[in-house]
Amino acid sequence: LRLLDHRALVCSQPGLNCTVKNSTCLDDSWIHPRNLTPSSPKDLQIQLHFAHTQQGDLFPVAHIEWTLQTDASILYLEGAELSVLQLNTNERLCVRFEFLSKLRHHHRRWRFTFSHFVVDPDQEYEVTVHHLPKPIPDGDPNHQSKNFLVPDCEHARMKVTTPCMSSGSLWDPNITVETLEAHQLRVSFTLWNESTHYQILLTSFPHMENHSCFEHMHHIPAPRPEEFHQRSNVTLTLRNLKGCCRHQVQIQPFFSSCLNDCLRHSATVSCPEMPDTPEPIPDYMPLW
């Protein structure tokens, strides 16, 4: 988790002087509770936005937006703590909006936005906005949280972001898999425009089960430049194991931008359909 660039971040708007500061995610008001605290944020919205760095790289960011409730507690609102928690790693990053002037009611509802948390493809986050100061230990909570799922690199807009392109998202191998006679699979895919090797992983499963019954690898050496964008054809021999009939083929490239952690593409061959056996017709009619 990180913030997009480190140029000065602003949260000021007409009628409010505000600055964005790094936060330890442990506001002082936890340790020194105040008597009067503001109410919680209203209408917290998290959206996927895209932003360029100063170097021109494009990254997915969490666009966080919320409004204030129209009650007198805004007189005690000193700022907000924005927290983003990556759920699979428990990594957390926070920033603090510090209000340098007192808020006053005006004809429009106060609205705040922040779009500088860089998020990763195919990850889930919990976004929390805490109004500051935080409540006393038994006080009503004054935060709002929402979960936010970032699409993977198959998503049209995500595909062209720097992290996705670095992991090989622009390569479309257009995998085809056909079953041949004598327990063989013919795998065909389009090579990318880079002289790098590929690894094919075949995993076979019984019908309707997820425990593999056979696993095999095939290594494809780096193609020559004249083979770029050409189809590569590989014949894999299956093991004649009864019922081991559903096959998943994964292709892992080793592009220079992602090395041994590139996006894999896969195709699956289902077990052949079993013909429905018709009910046997008795050759005599019972008399009862």
Partner: nanobody, 112 residues
Framework: EVQLVESGGGLVQAGGSLRLSCVAS???????MAWYRQAPGKQREFVAH???????NYADSVRGRFTISRDNSKNTLYLQIDSLKPEDTAVYFC???????WGQGTQVTVSS
């Protein structure tokens, strides 16, 4: 959390032998496994793999000199490397392709 830990590397003279080991902790493996290697300033390259039934395949440059094997009861993958050449100098990595797990590598240096 699955971890792959390689060992057995070292400095050896040309023509010598080593046996590399890779222990998988945190899970049992009966899956396809592989060895890769990476020489300084070069791309990581395939060395050998073994499938779930014990079938093996080797890169042309090591065929006949290297032998991949496994002991599922010990959760261990091996690479026996014989008739070593200076061009075999590299960091050797163990790979569990199904989950794309990689070890940290073990250094093999062959002196002429």
């Amino acid at each position: 959390e699955v971890q792959l830990v390689e060992s057995g590397g070292g400095l050896v003279q040309a023509g010598g032998s080593l046996r590399l080991s890779c222990v998988a902790s945190g899970s049992t493996f009966g899956n396809a496994m592989a060895w890769y290697r990476q020489a300084p300033g070069k791309q990581r390259e395939f060395v050998a793999h073994i499938n779930s039934l014990g079938g093996t395949n080797y890169a042309d440059s090591v065929r006949g000199r290297f032998t991949i094997s496994r002991d599922n009861s010990k959760n261990t993958l091996y690479l026996q490397i014989d008739s070593l050449k200076p061009e075999d100098t590299a960091v050797y990595f163990c790979n569990w392709p199904r989950y794309n797990y990689w070890g940290q590598g073990t250094q093999v240096t062959v002196s002429s």
